[in-house]
């Protein structure tokens, strides 16, 4: 039975040219995390594997910094970065947990962080 929950940074906004931290946290389970995938819609951004470290997708290579922790820092934001992002936690023995973040990249200087929320 999957008991865990994923907490994410929720709906967030940031300015064009700036950077943003995409962050998820898996709680309420003793399952071992073996890998975390970061995806934008159906496109892979990065993988963090417990044994092999980080792999960054070539299309994002120049503007992604792994971290903080299992999170991802996306730099040099463009309006094309607006959209849904997913953290996919591969765990044993529970299986897969997925969290969703919506990022809006704004032209203006009015960019505020949304509240945190949980996905069971």
């Amino acid at each position: 039975m999957m008991t865990g929950t994923i907490e994410t940074t929720g709906n967030i906004s940031a300015e064009k040219g700036g950077s943003i931290i995409l962050q998820c946290h898996l709680s309420s389970t003793t399952a071992q995390v073996t890998q975390v995938n970061w995806e934008q819609q159906d496109q892979l951004l990065a993988i963090c594997n417990a044994d092999l470290g980080w792999h960054i997708s070539p299309s994002f290579k120049d503007r992604v910094a792994p971290g903080p922790g299992l999170g991802l820092t996306l730099q040099s934001l463009t309006v094309n970065d607006t959209g849904e992002y997913f953290c996919i936690y591969h765990t044993y023995p529970d299986g897969t947990y997925t969290g969703r973040i919506f990022l809006e990249v704004l032209e203006s200087s009015v960019a505020e962080h949304g509240a945190r929320f949980q996905i069971p």
Epitope: I21, Q23, S27, L52, W54, P66, P68, G69, L70
Partner: antibody, heavy 118, light 106 residues
Framework: QAYLQQSGAELVRSGASVKMSCKAS????????MHWVKQTPGQGLEWIGY????????TYSQKFKDKATLTADTSSSTAYMQISSLTSEDSAVYFC???????????WGQGTSVTVSS | QIVLTQSPEIMSASPGEKVTMTCSAS?????MHWYQQKSGTSPKRWIY???KLASGVPARFSGSGSGTSYSLTISSMEAEDSATYFC?????????FGAGTKLELK
């Protein structure tokens, strides 16, 4: 087994700069963040920043962004840190440390001692 | 930035005694990591992800906590446990360390 070998102690003049190295072995250098940490008796452990050698992207603590420059050479699996405009406040031991899964630093170099003389 | 406050700063314990030290965060973090450092040596990862023991760490050590309150416990103090212990978070930038708890043998 991962291993980090740092360069030797440095005695440098005030106002000069120093560049130290951290040679990694036993793992795929490009796949792990390399953090740099300053240790002084008065300030304990202070995070300077990190570099991801796979793409050279760096992140600095605000306190050190105009003081330290992090680089990495994947061909030799070596990370470097340059500290500029040295003052007595920069006298410390500097460690490189590999960023492990989840954000803990799982392997540390032996440290490079920097002494700034006036 | 997230400030980590360790207490006590210095403590001493007799062999066999239970030891608990704490690390309080100025805002909530998802995990805490702990390092052991002995004089003249590099820090060693000791406990990571709040409660996982690093390779080679004796089972008498344990870690626990959540939110803003975390602790490291030694069930039965031994001479080799004398060291300084630092907590560390990387929930967001900047990564921060606590000032350390120095544990001495009584």
């Amino acid at each position: 087994q991962a291993y980090l070998q740092q360069s030797g102690a440095e005695l440098v003049r005030s106002g000069a700069s120093v560049k130290m190295s951290c040679k990694a072995s036993g793992y795929t250098f490009s796949n792990y963040n390399m953090h740099w940490v300053k240790q002084t008796p008065g300030q304990g452990l202070e995070w300077i920043g990190y570099i991801f050698p796979g793409n050279g992207v760096t992140t600095y603590s605000q306190k050190f962004k105009d003081k330290a420059t992090l680089t990495a050479d994947t061909s030799s699996s070596t990370a470097y840190m340059q500290i500029s405009s040295l003052t007595s406040e920069d006298s410390a031991v500097y460690f490189c440390a590999r960023g492990g899964f989840g954000g803990a630093m799982d392997y540390w170099g032996q440290g490079t001692s920097v002494t700034v003389s006036s | 930035q997230i400030v980590l406050t360790q207490s006590p700063e210095i403590m001493s314990a007799s062999p066999g005694e239970k030891v608990t030290m704490t690390c309080s965060a100025s805002s909530s973090v998802s995990h805490m990591h702990w390092y052991q450092q002995k004089s003249g040596t590099s820090p060693k990862r000791w406990i990571y992800d709040t409660s996982k023991l690093a390779s080679g760490v004796p089972a008498r050590f344990s870690g626990s906590g959540s939110g803003t309150s975390y602790s490291l416990t030694i069930s039965s103090m031994e001479a080799e446990d004398s060291a300084t212990y630092f907590c560390q978070q990387w929930n967001n930038n900047p990564l921060t360390f606590g000032a350390g708890t120095k544990l001495e043998l009584k």
